[in-house]
């Protein structure tokens, strides 16, 4: 008689990443008997919730349920029914909700309340919705990429599983760019982390890690753009803002009330003699770069060295994975290749920003104009942040790897978050049982 395959003994987990500009649902899967092994959890599905981030529903919280329906239904379809009740669901909200909470704790609580009620209606094991800290966001992103790269495994492999993987156990640093915040996380080389707020200690798989992390609230690409506009309109002579970060020929009317809606622009707020102003693109990379640099205060540093705004940053060490919007923007601009030097990236950005808006619209007809119009700014911002903000150089640029997925799983904080909450990263190295790592295929 033929051998019948035994039913898969697998487990599933769901994490919703409620970001400032959108929400994504991730479904993870792993063999039940290998929970403590490194690298066994993988992503089986990403469902991007259709619409903006949850913080935008503050005036219509009763509609959050509709907004989440489609992706929760997708989870119901992907995960076998027999597994529904034991599948944990976690929702973590990031900087968009941190900003809303700064404005009104009550409103932020109301949004999370409705999110919790909506998610509790599904047959899964809902574990709660919360606003994660910037420190957690950085730390979990770092755990995710190093877990997927196999950096926590004690067994050195003779092969590489991803193109940029070095064969040693040196961890990768993590660079995460969102819409409202950006995180930098890495293990510095024998360096004291001078500010306790930026220090994390982990013991993972029997090894100790002293990790530096910082999250810069308001320095995600969308909030950085609002900051830049608020700063530049202060010195505009009238309601026309000639902006080097937008393509020549581009025009857009901005409401002053929208500009000052976010806490991120409070420091630039002033009474203006107009309710609206018009952005007129002039498409000049160099001037755009200069304007962005004015958002980084580098005149004050109470430590041996800083990133910007008086925030401690140790000397950069090792390779870095740059993901989320770092990747999406650079991918759109076709600048993710390992072979592209920093000088080449700058050159390409100069050309891209100088292209007329009408030409850009024709070349990228399938892209929404709002997104399309902001790639010049976003690309320039990424260069400014990495070079002047974090002190990467033309030489160390080659240590930045723009990563979308590793082994089919998205780079980001969600996997690390789930691994932590399901206790799947042991402090000590698990005792290896014969063949438990599928040594023989």
């Amino acid at each position: 008689t033929q051998n019948k395959a035994l039913p898969e003994n697998v487990k599933y987990g769901i994490v919703l990443d409620a970001g400032s500009s959108h929400t994504s649902l991730y479904i993870y899967k792993w063999p039940a008997e290998k929970e403590n092994d490194t690298g066994v959890v993988h992503q089986v599905e990403e469902c991007r919730v259709k619409g903006p981030g949850i913080s935008k529903f503050v005036q219509k919280v009763n509609e959050i349920g509709i907004y989440l329906t489609d992706c929760m239904e997708r989870a119901r379809e992907v995960i076998p029914r027999s597994q529904h009740q034991e599948t944990p669901v976690y929702l973590g909200a990031t900087a968009g909700m941190r900003l809303l909470r700064m404005e009104s704790e009550e409103l932020a609580d109301r949004v999370l309340d409705v999110v919790e009620r909506s998610l509790s209606n599904y047959p899964f094991d809902f574990q709660g919705a919360r606003i994660i800290t910037g420190q957690e966001e950085g730390a979990y992103g770092w755990i995710t990429i190093n877990y997927l790269l196999g950096k926590f495994s004690q067994k050195t492999r003779w092969f590489s599983i991803v193109p940029y993987e070095t064969n040693n156990q040196e961890t990768f640093g993590a660079l995460d760019l969102g819409g409202a915040s950006t995180q930098v996380t890495f293990v510095p080389q024998n360096q004291t982390i001078e500010s306790p707020d930026n220090a994390l200690q982990f013991r993972l798989y029997g090894k100790d890690y002293n990790v530096y992390t910082h999250s810069f609230l308001c320095y995600g690409k969308d909030q950085a753009l609002w900051q830049k506009l608020a700063k530049d309109i202060q010195v505009a002579s009238n309601e026309i803002l000639r902006d080097p970060c937008f393509h020549p020929g581009y025009k857009k009317v901005v409401n002053v009330s929208d500009l000052y809606k976010t806490p991120c622009t409070k420091r630039f707020e002033m009474t203006l003699p107009f309710q609206q102003f018009e952005i007129q693109g002039i498409g000049n990379y160099q001037q755009c770069h200069q304007s962005i640099l004015e958002l980084f205060n580098t005149s004050y540093c109470p430590y041996s060295q800083c990133a910007f705004n008086g925030i401690f940053l140790p000397p950069l060490q090792g390779d870095f994975g740059a993901f989320s919007a770092f990747y999406f923007v650079m991918k759109f601009l076709n600048l993710t290749s390992e072979k592209v030097s920093q000088e080449k990236v700058t050159e390409m950005m100069k050309k891209f920003c100088a292209q007329p808006w009408e030409e850009i619209k024709t070349s990228y007809a399938g892209v929404k104009e709002k997104y399309l119009s902001e790639y010049c700014f976003s690309g320039t911002y990424i260069l400014s942040l990495l070079l002047q903000g974090y002190h990467f150089t033309a030489d160390s640029w080659e240590h930045i790897h723009f990563i979308g997925k590793i082994q089919g799983s998205d780079a980001g904080w969600t996997l690390g978050y789930m691994l932590n909450l399901t206790n799947m990263i042991p402090a000590e190295q698990p005792l290896s049982t014969p063949l438990s790592h599928s040594t023989y295929v």
Partner: antibody
Framework: EVQLVQSGAELKKPGASVKISCKVS????????LNWVKQAPGKGLEWIGN????????RYNQKFKGRVTITIDQSTSTAYMELSSLRSEDTAVYYC??????????????WGQGTLVTVSS | EIVLTQSPATLSLSPGERATISCSAS?????MHWFQQKPGQAPKLWIY???NLASGVPARFSGSGSGTDYTLTISSMEPEDFAVYYC?????????FGGGTKVEIK
């Protein structure tokens, strides 16, 4: 402003296949699911299926499964619905549509103008 | 699949009269959406998420309900309101529509 423009009317013989297109503009193509709905003459509305251009994932109504294929061409922001093994009861107007929340959390629902498919020998 | 049953199938009214259309679901849904359709036109979203009027829909329209029973009400019929109305659930797949209610002039 979101626009969905469908291909023109089709006359097909029983047993043949038909492929209808729906070109979208005014938004980022990967942002929303694209749905297909059938309306036979003088009858009600029937959901056929949808596609998520972001992931490429499709869902079909069991009633049409096996005969319908929904695809997309991201380069032209166009969705297609192909119906095979046509029979007379497939004579209908077919609509493409999308719905969801825009960047300001306003709900919207937009439909194409419809494509009449006539199945007749 | 969730079956939606609309009643009545036809409603004959005069301008100024009140119209009430019901939609009953075979199992509980979180929200109901309503569409208006006129001859030769694509359906138009009229009420979304049970009670929210779509853009441009007059205030004489209202929606209510929960669970399995939902209602669309027109407080005082105007000539342009005579059309076919469909309910639709988007809570679970496959998405389903009610059979429609034709509101005609008496």
């Amino acid at each position: 402003e979101v626009q969905l423009v469908q291909s023109g009317a089709e006359l097909k013989k029983p047993g043949a296949s038909v492929k209808i297109s729906c070109k979208v503009s005014g938004y980022s193509f990967t942002d929303y699911n694209l749905n297909w709905v059938k309306q036979a003459p003088g009858k009600g509305l029937e959901w056929i299926g949808n596609i998520d251009p972001y992931s490429g994932g499709t869902r079909y109504n069991q009633k049409f499964k096996g005969r319908v294929t929904i695809t997309i061409d991201q380069s032209t922001s166009t969705a297609y619905m192909e119906l095979s093994s046509l029979r007379s009861e497939d004579t209908a107007v077919y609509y493409c549509g999308l719905y969801g929340y825009d960047d300001d959390a306003n709900y919207f629902d937009d439909w194409g103008q419809g494509t009449l498919v006539t199945v007749s020998s | 699949e969730i079956v939606l049953t609309q009643s009545p199938a036809t409603l004959s009214l005069s301008p100024g009269e009140r119209a009430t259309i019901s939609c009953s679901a075979s199992s509980s849904v979180s929200y109901m959406h309503w569409f208006q359709q006129k001859p030769g036109q694509a359906p138009k979203l009229w009420i979304y998420a049970t009670s929210n009027l779509a853009s441009g829909v007059p205030a004489r329209f209202s929606g209510s309900g929960s669970g399995t029973d939902y209602t669309l009400t027109i407080s005082s019929m105007e000539p342009e309101d005579f059309a076919v109305y469909y309910c639709q659930q988007r809570s679970s797949y496959p998405l389903t529509f009610g059979g429609g209610t034709k509101v005609e002039i008496k």
